[in-house]
């Protein structure tokens, strides 16, 4: 029998120091470029090897970025979000949402982390 797939959503504050080549990641999303259905949020699509984000290690591909230096990324055009990152300065604080896929036990059995029984 197939297990049920659930998601564990956590938030984290990540402080990055801009490196010689910048912050070192790529994004998708925005009100004019929805990457996820019915969600105009900004998502990390790629972490660049040896960039600031990769060396820090906490930001992951697929993470949703909620804010940059305290500025909310809701309802932003894609290019406005890009510009916000590019103008964020040397020390950059990111509020991010991680979405971790959790594979529960087979249906009909109580799997670990499945409080519904």
């Amino acid at each position: 029998m197939n297990g049920r797939v659930d998601y564990l959503v956590t938030e984290e504050e990540i402080n990055l120091t801009r490196g010689p080549s910048g912050l070192g990641f790529n994004i998708v999303g925005g009100t004019d470029q929805q990457y996820v259905s019915n969600d105009s949020g900004i998502y990390v699509s790629r972490i660049k090897e040896n960039g600031a984000a990769a060396l820090d290690g906490r930001l992951q591909e697929g993470d949703k970025i909620l804010s940059v230096n305290g500025q909310d990324l809701k309802n932003l055009l894609h290019q406005d979000a890009v510009d916000l990152f590019r103008n964020a300065g040397y020390a950059v604080s990111l509020r991010v949402q991680h979405r971790l896929q959790v594979q529960n036990g087979p249906i009909g059995h109580r799997g670990e982390g499945d409080p519904s029984g």
Partner: nanobody
Framework: QVQLVESGGGLVQAGGSLRLSCAAS????????MGWFRQAPGKEREFAAH????????NYADSVKGRFTISRDNAKNTMYLQMNSLKPEDTAVYYC?????????????????????WGQGTQVTVS
Amino acid sequence: QVQLVESGGGLVQAGGSLRLSCAASGRTFSTYTMGWFRQAPGKEREFAAHINWSGGSTNYADSVKGRFTISRDNAKNTMYLQMNSLKPEDTAVYYCAAAIWSSVDSYDHSDPLEYDYWGQGTQVTVS
């Protein structure tokens, strides 16, 4: 997964024109940053042209500037390369490339490593 299929290549005389197409499938095409690259026999793959996701920004290699025009039709999931005043040195396999991102840093759109997906290529021969 993103699939890219080039078409429109062929044999043309010097001074002639060709229009290459790159049809994309997979994710939402309108989020892709796109580029055309080319590879001549015995040479490395080189950048020809780049277009951003909206079509509002384009860049060209010096060798094709003024002769080639890159464009895209997001409704048709297709990118184009109009090649005019072709020269024998334009002979190469032409590849389209796609990336589903915008860099939060300035990036080098002429670097093949900045692109995530590649087509199989279409041969252009200028005699």
